[in-house]
Amino acid sequence: APTSSSTKKTQLQLEHLLLDLQMILNGINNYKNPKLTRMLTFKFYMPKKATELKHLQCLEEELKPLEEVLNLAQSKNFHLRPRDLISNINVIVLELKGSETTFMCEYADETATIVEFLNRWITFCQSIISTLT
């Protein structure tokens, strides 16, 4: 059974992941640039199911494409430093989902824009945090 300290650590990591995802979405929403239209043409795979920490495997597999899209946005008005940001998310995701369990991600048939993708994972974090508090 999880201890209160391990639950607290999980909650903190989820809160950090949530903040990182919200920061990306905020940066994109603030982005007044022709590149934004191009960013929205990129398609992301969505998880068929995302209700447990092991499902973060689906997010991990999309981090490289996410970094590539964010690299497009680099400008003096975009302060998110994709490499550092994605690296941070990757570390959190690996710790949260654990490395000892092998989970094959199942994706939904429909792909999504970066905004839909981020909103989906933000909702995921919020729902799990809510069960922990």
Epitope: H16, L19, Q22, M23, N29, S87, Q126, S130
Partner: antibody, heavy 113, light 107 residues
Framework: QVQLVQSGAEVKKPGASVKVSCKAS????????MHWVRQAPGQGLEWMGI????????TYAQKFQGRVTMTRDTSTSTVYMELSSLRSEDTAVYYC??????WGQGTLVTVSS | DIQMTQSPSSLSASVGDRVTITCRAS??????LAWYQQKPGKAPKLLIY???TLESGVPSRFSGSGSGTDFTLTISSLQPEDFATYYC?????????FGQGTKVEIK
């Protein structure tokens, strides 16, 4: 005991820039994201942006986009908020807040010609 | 951006009174709501997060309730040190936004 100590009050002329610092002690600096919030005299609270002290990346409220820059120095456990092209409406107390539960004491910035 | 509307903007009450402040969000924020207390010349102090969870060290006379768009902060028995301005804040989506504040004054 977690503590945030901000730099002292500043008086600036319109068009100038101001850089406010916020030094953290009592916890792992890189562990908590830092928000900046301001409060104009007699007014409510307004979120300006957030920085991840670990990665150094930040995002800002649309209203301040292009005028605000948040940075950090991990060697001194300090985050900075720089606001440029100051106008009289920027006269306010500027707060840093770590994880929303710990706040700095505030820094009064007065913009006056 | 999500708009947060508090009511009333000010109220007068006596020590021992039960005080209720309401906060309404322009769209559902689930339970992602916090309440702060601020005294003149001081930084805001977190009282309640996640709608109803009391921050460590906050007296039990403070309580929060609600979900979705409508939230309430209740002070069961007002104490002299409770006269201050109270703010609600949503952290459901960026940018985080605050209510305009409710000033609790001595009657």
């Amino acid at each position: 005991q977690v503590q945030l100590v901000q730099s002292g009050a500043e008086v600036k002329k319109p068009g100038a820039s101001v850089k406010v610092s916020c030094k953290a002690s009592g916890h792992t600096f890189t562990r908590y994201y830092m928000h900046w919030v301001r409060q104009a005299p007699g007014q409510g609270l307004e979120w300006m942006g957030i920085i991840n002290p670990s990665g150094g990346y930040a995002t800002y409220a649309q209203k301040f986009q292009g005028r605000v820059t948040m940075t950090r120095d991990t060697s001194t456990s300090t985050v900075y908020m720089e606001l440029s092209s100051l106008r009289s409406e920027d006269t306010a107390v500027y707060y840093c807040a770590s994880g929303w539960d710990v706040w700095g004491q505030g820094t009064l910035v007065t913009v006056s010609s | 951006d999500i708009q947060m509307t508090q009511s009333p903007s000010s109220l007068s009450a006596s020590v021992g009174d039960r005080v209720t402040i309401t906060c309404r969000a322009s769209q559902s924020i689930n339970s992602w709501l916090a309440w702060y207390q601020q005294k003149p010349g001081k930084a805001p102090k977190l009282l309640i997060y996640a709608t109803s969870t009391l921050e460590s060290g906050v007296p039990s006379r403070f309580s929060g309730s609600g979900s979705g768009t409508d939230f309430t902060l209740t002070i069961s028995s007002l104490q002299p040190e409770d006269f201050a301005t109270y703010y609600c804040q949503q952290s459901y989506s960026f940018p985080p936004t605050f209510g305009q504040g409710t000033k609790v004054e001595i009657k």
